[in-house]
C-alpha cells in the first residue's frame, strides 16, 4: 500500500478515503513532493504582505512586502519601512545620515565614508549622505605641483549610530 502512495506525484495527495488513489490538491493547497498523504495549505500574502508568486498545486505562494517596505527574515517573515537613500531607520523613523556617513540603499544603516588616507590615497570626489567618497591616486602619484583639493574624510567611530 505504501508503494501506491509513493507513485502520487507533486500536486496530488494519496487519498486514503478513495483506496489510496492520487487525488489533486484542493484549491489553495499544494504538495511540493510526491507521496504526500495531505496537501499543505497555501500561505496567504495579506496585510503588509503582497503576493510575489502565486500558489500552485506544486509550490507554495511567496510573499513580498507592500510598496514602501522591504522584507526581513526567512521567507519574508517581517516587513520594515523603507527609507530614502541618505537615511537610516531608527526607532523614531527615518533619519538623515550624520555628516561623514552615507547610505546608498533604501534599507540598512548609514556607514562611514571610506578614509582614503588609510590606503595612502586622496579624495577624488567628496562623499555625500547618499554616496561614499571616491578615492583617487595617492598624493605622491600626482605630478609635481598638483595636490589633492580635498582633505581625507573623517571616519565615524565604529559602533556609533545616530538615534
Amino acid at each position: 500500500l505504501q508503494d501506491l502512495c509513493s507513485n502520487c506525484p507533486a500536486g496530488t495527495f494519496c487519498d486514503n478515503n478513495r483506496s489510496q488513489i492520487c487525488s489533486p490538491c484542493p484549491p489553495n493547497s499544494f504538495s511540493s513532493a510526491g507521496g504526500q498523504r495531505t496537501c499543505d495549505i497555501c500561505r496567504q500574502c495579506k496585510g503588509v504582505f503582497k503576493t510575489r508568486k502565486e500558489c500552485s498545486s506544486t509550490s507554495n505562494a511567496e510573499c513580498d512586502c507592500i510598496s514602501g517596505y522591504h522584507c526581513l527574515g526567512a521567507e519574508c517573515s517581517m516587513c520594515e519601512q523603507d527609507c530614502k537613500q541618505g537615511q537610516e531607520l531608527t526607532k523614531k523613523g527615518c533619519k538623515d545620515c550624520c555628516f561623514g556617513t552615507f547610505n546608498d540603499q533604501k534599507r540598512g544603516i548609514c556607514r562611514p565614508w571610506t578614509n582614503c588616507s588609510l590606503d595612502g590615497k586622496s579624495v577624488l570626489v567628496n562623499g555625500t549622505k547618499e554616496r561614499d567618497v571616491v578615492c583617487g591616486p595617492s598624493p605622491a602619484d600626482l605630478s609635481p605641483g598638483a595636490s589633492s583639493a580635498t582633505p581625507p574624510a573623517p571616519a565615524r567611530e565604529p559602533g556609533h549610530s545616530p538615534q
Epitope: D40, I41, R43, Q44, K46, G47, V48, F49, N60, I66, G68, Y69, L72, G73, A74, E75, C76, S77, M78, C79, E80, Q81, K91, K92, G93, C94
Partner: antibody, heavy 115, light 107 residues
Framework: QVQLQQWGAGLLKPSETLSLTCAVY????????WSWIRQPPGKGLEWIGE???????DSNPSLKGRVTFSVDTSKNQFSLKLNSVTAADTAVYYC?????????WGQGTLVTVSS | EIVMTQSPATLSVSPGERATLSCRAS??????LAWYQQKPGQAPRLLIY???TRATGIPARFSGSGSGTEFTLTISSLQSEDFAVYYC?????????FGGGTKVEIK
C-alpha cells in the same frame, strides 16, 4: 521610539457598543497595518482585526460582523467599535502594529461588560 | 483556521537553567511564526519572528527553531526577568491565531 497609547470606556452594559481608540506616536503611521487583539481575564490572546491607513480592513470571522474599524490619518489614530457586547467580550483590549508579527503594542484597556 | 497548541501549560524552572517551550500548528505554516513574552499587567513583547529571528533588542539567550508544524523557543539560561507567560502566533494564514501560552515559573 514608536508608542501606542489607547483609551476608551472601561465599563459597559450588555448590548452596548464598545469603543476604543489608539494613537500612534513616533515612527510612521501611513503604510503600516494596525491591529486590535483582546485577552479575556486569565486567558490567551485573540486577534480581532486590522486596518491600514488607507482604510482597508480585515477581521476575525468569529466576531460575526459585530466589529468596525476606522482610521484618522490626520491624528495618527485608529479606532475599534464592537457592537452588541455580552459578558463574553470582557477582556483587556490591545492595539498593536502589524508588520507580519505584532512588533509594537499599546498598554491595554480593560473592558468589563456587566449588567 | 490554524490552531496553535503550546506545551507544557506550565514549566517550573530554576534560575540559570535552560527552558524549552513547544508550539505545534494544526497544519504546516513553514516558518511564519512569532513568539511573545508577557508579564503580569503588561502587553506582550515580540521576541522572535520568522520562527528563528530575534527581534530588535532581544537578548541572545532567547532562540527559536522549527519549521512546518513543530516549533521551539529556548531560553538558554533563565534570568529572574524571564519568568512570564510565552505565546506563539502564526501569521501564515488569516485569521491570525495564538497558542494558549506557556507559563514559565520559578521552581
Amino acid at each position: 521610539q514608536v508608542q501606542l497609547q489607547q483609551w476608551g470606556a472601561g465599563l459597559l452594559k450588555p448590548s452596548e457598543t464598545l469603543s476604543l481608540t489608539c494613537a500612534v506616536y513616533g515612527g510612521s503611521f501611513s503604510g503600516y497595518y494596525w491591529s486590535w487583539i483582546r485577552q479575556p481575564p486569565g486567558k490567551g490572546l485573540e486577534w480581532i482585526g486590522e486596518i491600514q491607513h488607507s482604510g482597508s480592513t480585515d477581521s476575525n470571522p468569529s466576531l460575526k460582523g459585530r466589529v468596525t474599524f476606522s482610521v484618522d490619518t490626520s491624528k495618527n489614530q485608529f479606532s475599534l467599535k464592537l457592537n452588541s457586547v455580552t459578558a463574553a467580550d470582557t477582556a483587556v483590549y490591545y492595539c498593536a502594529r502589524l508588520t507580519g508579527p505584532f512588533d509594537y503594542w499599546g498598554q491595554g484597556t480593560l473592558v468589563t461588560v456587566s449588567s | 483556521e490554524i490552531v496553535m497548541t503550546q506545551s507544557p501549560a506550565t514549566l517550573s524552572v530554576s534560575p540559570g537553567e535552560r527552558a524549552t517551550l513547544s508550539c505545534r500548528a494544526s497544519q504546516s505554516i513553514s516558518s511564519i511564526l512569532a513568539w511573545y513574552q508577557q508579564k503580569p499587567g503588561q502587553a506582550p513583547r515580540l521576541l522572535i519572528y520568522g520562527a528563528s529571528t530575534r527581534a530588535t533588542g532581544i537578548p541572545a539567550r532567547f532562540s527559536g527553531s522549527g519549521s512546518g508544524t513543530e516549533f521551539t523557543l529556548t531560553i538558554s539560561s533563565l534570568q529572574s526577568e524571564d519568568f512570564a507567560v510565552y505565546y506563539c502566533q502564526q501569521y501564515y494564514n488569516w485569521p491570525l491565531t495564538f497558542g494558549g501560552g506557556t507559563k514559565v515559573e520559578i521552581k
